[in-house]
Amino acid sequence: MAPWPELGDAQPNPDKYLEGAAGQQPTAPDKSKETNKTDNTEAPVTKIELLPSYSTATLIDEPTEVDDPWNLPTLQDSGIKWSERDTKGKILCFFQGIGRLILLLGFLYFFVCSLDILSSAFQLVGGKMAGQFFSNSSIMSNPLLGLVIGVLVTVLVQSSSTSTSIVVSMVSSSLLTVRAAIPIIMGANIGTSITNTIVALMQVGDRSEFRRAFAGATVHDFFNWLSVLVLLPVEVATHYLEIITQLIVESFHFKNGEDAPDLLKVITKPFTKLIVQLDKKVISQIAMNDEKAKNKSLVKIWCKTFTNKTQINVTVPSTANCTSPSLCWTDGIQNWTMKNVTYKENIAKCQHIFVNFHLPDLAVGTILLILSLLVLCGCLIMIVKILGSVLKGQVATVIKKTINTDFPFPFAWLTGYLAILVGAGMTFIVQSSSVFTSALTPLIGIGVITIERAYPLTLGSNIGTTTTAILAALASPGNALRSSLQIALCHFFFNISGILLWYPIPFTRLPIRMAKGLGNISAKYRWFAVFYLIIFFFLIPLTVFGLSLAGWRVLVGVGVPVVFIIILVLCLRLLQSRCPRVLPKKLQNWNFLPLWMRSLKPWDAVVSKFTGCFQMRCCCCCRVCCRACCLLCDCPKCCRCSKCCEDLEEAQEGQDVPVKAPETFDNITISREAQGEVPASDSKTECTAL
């Protein structure tokens, strides 16, 4: 199946041109400079001549020129200017601003808490299964299996730190070698990027917002997948990560350090521990083949326990069974002996909602999964709304310029590296790459941060999470110190290698181009976003897992033809876009393939039929519900209460978004609303800080 459909007769657009290597980041689009594309991924693109009847763009612009959907929207400020306000108005505006800030911080707090609870929910639903993945003996010999186990486990427990700590404990216990652990760590790196992709799905309501948010989130996915694609074979062939980290570990005489500082957890833990508390040791115990752990619940019941090594009296059949006569006696009826036991006395129960319910882990997990997703979604909507009302006019201009503008020449290239450092620093502070990248996603969506700027921030986030792991490793007990430090360093150097591959040269920033391509597809066919998530994070890893279990022969037998077809398609695609004359006329486009193999349109029809039953009875009860509905069915016939279905005509027009080559993007006319230029509901209540 050709991955770049509907490119048959695409004619290059002479008006568009490639930007220089400096990669100047865009600010708010200027109408006078509309053709100056700021995306360093730009290439020729098809013009869309027809404009929708409702678009006001026809009254202002030339009909042949359309806005680049990747340009940041102008967040219009329709409020009264600060200078024009009277004292009462200024005071009112000031308190409104304070109120908004408090609300923003409040929703941000619950957003982060819901991410934590989402992780707990995933662990309750799939934690034990995740633990059992690790107990597979084939991991030692099959790096591909190790990789997919890393992905699946991290997706199932929604925490790369949990999966890496399991790996560390397995290496410390000699159940796993460092060599076998490296692919698992690579997989964990991929798995952790699902969180912000899920967060991006929550912004499905507005097409242009969703386009940016989803691309901004998946840039992380593509970076990780591409890094693994290149670095896993390199590691298997050279073992460079293993060798470098071993040299580092052996050259230093590390003493046990202190724990990595819990900065964000200090604030969120008081709340999240009232919802649920988990005994994460259970997953590790299952991974290490502890049979007893399989029947244990992950929900923590006792928080205060007293562990005492003591000798207890136990009965024995006869005095012959005694260890020594001095430790043996009778009570006249039974024979007794002394046995050394570690006695755990439960003192105080945990203070969380589920402590007295005694529900199975799956039930608790399902409840928490639904609730955390609802809270996550609700908080995200509110954050976007508040940011939307705050970031208008001059405020937006200042913020956008600060975040997205490069250093002056000749230091422009340094900006990205500073962003990497900022990303690493922020992740170190919040102690979680998932939290940082998830917080970044809505900002990309509403157009505060460009994807070009989000990319280095995300890369920095990947580094930040490994520095946390290194600190945690230094705090490990003696026996686990070496292995945990070596694994943490492998993680660190893997990410550094990935950055060296996909960042320094603008041409190599493939993840941005791929993410934008996926953003375009997902904006048009919103179901494709869910499809992508299932395929990349579940189906592909599970398929590889299944084939690996069947043995090397089966894996190679199926894998080689698949890889061959993918390479063939990519080569053909490259020739089609670069030098089509080399190819026979038939192969110069994809028209020789049936429509379902080169376009998502037929698939969209299938999905629409499948979800048709939901379309008529969509939920108009609330925005949250409506967004979920829109994600499923694009819902053009109802839900007038939400933005998600206001682009009825756009959906009915059926302008197919081509799944294009990485270096091309679509030009779609966006309504004023989609551009973010929504008029304020009441100018009296709107105010700007500047």
């Epitope: 009296n313 005095t319 430790l327 043996c328 006696w329 009778t330 009570d331 006249g332």
Partner: antibody, heavy 119, light 107 residues
Amino acid sequence: QIQLVQSGAELVRPGASVKMSCKTSGYTFTTYNVHWVKQTPRQGLEWIGAISPGNGLTSYTQKFKAKATLTVDKSSSTAYMQLSSLTSEDSAVYFCARGGFRLGSMDYWGQGTSVTVSS
Amino acid sequence: DIVMTQSHKFMSTSVGDRVSVTCKASQNVGTSVAWYQQRPGQSPKELIYWASNRFTGVPDRFTGSGSGTDFTLTITNVQSEDLADYFCQQYSSPPLTFGAGTKLELK
């Protein structure tokens, strides 16, 4: 306080049987074993056997296996010992005693029941 | 069966003296030994368990010692009420067995 009160002295004919009681109080009857000990001037103290009131398990010394039968009545926290086929050899003072917790030592003793076998 | 031997049937002492009553087991019994005191016309009372642990309410002039096969009950500063029979008992393995007893009397 912990007390073990035994039934009064018995005068029985040879070949007959006797059943003596040991009423306990001041502790959880089912938690501690009840031991029976025979004392004669010639033999000194001899352990007859013990019973666990909680589960009814019994243990006898070989010499008394055919002679003694130990039972309990949990409702009245009373232990009983029946001696059968009595001979003059069985004339003695019989003590009931509470066993130490999971121990074979005896921490509290009854006042004793004197059994005289005579024709 | 384990035989507990108390070598002295009688031991003479004076008030205020120190006396040691001995007991020997026919095999290793560890520390599974108890000591009892029986005053004339009364039932036995437990003094020591686990060879050296004093039972509740027992005066500290009574001390138990020993392990394996040799055990000793020591009474320091003998009082007139201490004049009684003293029995050792093993509970290392069934059946429980007692020593023949040692009678403590005034010189």
